[in-house]
Interface confidence: medium
């Protein structure tokens, strides 16, 4: 992996990539953009999927956290031969199918979609794309759009969560490299630490959850801290404060010494969760300690 900033968030990341005829001579730039970005998401709990669309949508690589499968998926991505129309909605449809299936299986993992396209969508195709993006959102996804060359920023702002979720690349495909850092910064939601990481059994505490991207939620009122206790019961708590780099949350009262609470964060009122390897444990505290 190359150096520089990385994302430690555990969520499901979908790349939805335009492989219509208009990108025929620029597929290498798209591929290298995805490859470099993919290598920056390094949590072992992060899963990734590659979806391409032209006249139909195809899932090149289903959701996986297996780094070898991701490497093979990138190889398949490099071999793609662009051609056909810009049926972006077909790409979103493939993502929604996977999100829907994962939800049905009981995996309520947060989903982030990064959709890349060039050119303007004709009215009915835009209609379907907006609708399918809304369907993905309805299933809990956060949607970002990358527009290259002749894109329509107003259209992409309606397909993405907001205008702030659109990354315009006005200087052509070669400029894609220049937005990797800003995409990473905006799309990364990560939990890095909890303070304190050890709490007293039977007592109430506030926990500061350190991380990034907590204000990327469409509505910060829907952010929740979630504590998965001893791998069984999950308790959700509304934070007292939501900042981009930290949350201030009431911790659940854990009655026994040695209990473990795995920390998760929901950006959508518990519909889905960002996972982490951050654990809060209980210890015995004598009076006055």
């Amino acid at each position: 992996e190359d150096g520089g900033p990385a994302c430690y968030g555990g969520f499901d990341l979908y790349f939805i990539l335009d492989k219509s005829g208009s990108v025929l001579h620029h597929w290498n730039e798209i591929y290298y953009f995805v490859e470099q970005l993919a290598h920056k998401f390094i949590s072992p709990q992060l899963r990734m999927s590659f979806i391409v669309f032209s006249t139909r949508g195809t899932t090149l690589m289903k959701l996986t956290e297996d780094r070898e499968q991701i490497r093979q998926g990138l190889e398949e991505l490099q071999k793609v031969l662009p051609g056909g129309d810009t049926y972006m909605h077909e790409g979103f449809e493939r993502a929604s199918e996977q999100i829907y299936y994962e939800n049905r299986q009981g995996y309520r993992t947060a989903s982030v979609i990064i959709a890349l396209t060039d050119g303007e969508l004709h009215e009915d195709l835009f209609f379907y794309s907006e609708r399918e993006a809304n369907r993905s959102r309805d299933l809990g996804a956060i949607v970002y759009c990358v527009g290259v060359k002749d894109f329509n920023e107003t259209q992409l702002a309606r397909i993405a969560d907001s205008k702030d979720h659109v990354f315009p690349v006005n200087d052509g495909f070669q400029a894609l490299q220049g937005i990797i850092h800003s995409i990473l910064k905006k799309s990364c939601i990560e939990i890095l630490a909890a303070e304190p990481s050890t709490i007293c059994a039977g007592e109430s505490f506030q926990v500061v959850v350190r991380g990034n991207g907590f204000r990327h939620a469409r509505n910060v009122d829907r952010v929740l801290c979630s504590f998965k206790i001893n791998d069984s019961v999950t308790l959700n708590e509304k934070p007292f404060s939501v900042e981009d780099t930290y949350l201030l949350c009431p911790a659940p009262i854990l009655k026994e010494v040695g209990m473990k609470a795995a920390l998760q964060v929901s950006m959508n009122d518990g519909l889905s969760f960002i996972s982490s390897s951050v654990i809060i444990t209980t210890t015995h505290c004598s009076d006055g300690s």
Partner: antibody, heavy 118, light 107 residues
């Protein structure tokens, strides 16, 4: 509260043009999609077409080139024109809002009856 | 175009009983299926969207299920105001099409 109200003549002669207007209150036609749906006596509902928040239209191919949907954002109204009508176009005409978040028609006008007869 | 077929055409049920209405699409429409209620002289009213998602203000006795081509609207315990015609709608692809309706009448 969002309300839609259809208006226009209740009787149109065959081969003439049917013209209806839908006035929207409580929402702006510069957002979402604004539709016409009709229901002939004893028949199922038929989607006719929409005009989008940006002014683009999409219509049911079964109506071929007979249908035109326009809008007047200053009055927050959109309209339907159906050319070369026949008695088969006799129906209750509804305007309805469509939101892509539900992909459904979530608000409807109360409907206006149009009879095509000489 | 996608053809929507509803059955039965008429359903006779007593108040308090359960009513089950069916809708079939001529091709896979995933869960882009919506249910509407229409009373005489009134416009249709959206009851259920995306096959099973409830609309705020609609009583909990109305529920929907299904995916792909086969869908069901269930009214768990019929109230007098529920006797009406119910339509399903394909929301998947243009042109949007409706079923022929199921009339729920008092037995």
């Amino acid at each position: 509260e969002v309300q839609l109200q259809e208006s226009g003549p209740g009787l149109v002669k065959p081969s003439e043009t049917l013209s209806l207007t839908c006035t929207v209150t409580g929402d702006s036609i510069s957002s979402d999609y604004w539709n016409w749906v009709r229901q002939a006596p004893g028949q199922r509902l038929e989607w006719m077409g929409y005009i989008s928040y940006s002014g683009n239209t999409y219509t049911n191919p079964s109506l071929k080139s007979r249908i035109t949907i326009n809008r007047d954002t200053s009055k927050n109204q959109f309209s339907l024109q159906l050319n070369s009508v026949t008695p088969e176009d006799t129906a209750v005409y509804y305007c309805a809002r469509y939101k892509t978040i539900t992909s459904a028609f979530d608000v409807w006008g109360q409907g206006t009856t149009v009879t095509v007869s000489s | 175009e996608i053809v929507m077929t509803q059955s039965p055409a008429t359903l006779s049920v007593s108040p308090g009983e359960r009513a089950t209405l069916s809708c079939r699409a001529s091709q896979n429409i995933r869960d882009f299926l919506h249910w509407y209620q229409q009373k005489p002289g009134q416009a249709p009213r959206l009851l259920i969207y995306y096959a099973s998602q409830s609309i705020s203000g609609i009583p909990a006795r109305f529920s929907g299920s299904g995916s792909g081509t086969d869908f069901t609207l269930t009214i768990s315990s019929l109230e007098p105001e529920d006797f009406a015609v119910y339509y399903c709608q394909n929301g998947h692809s243009f042109p949007y099409t409706f079923g022929g309706g199921t009339k729920v009448e008092i037995k």
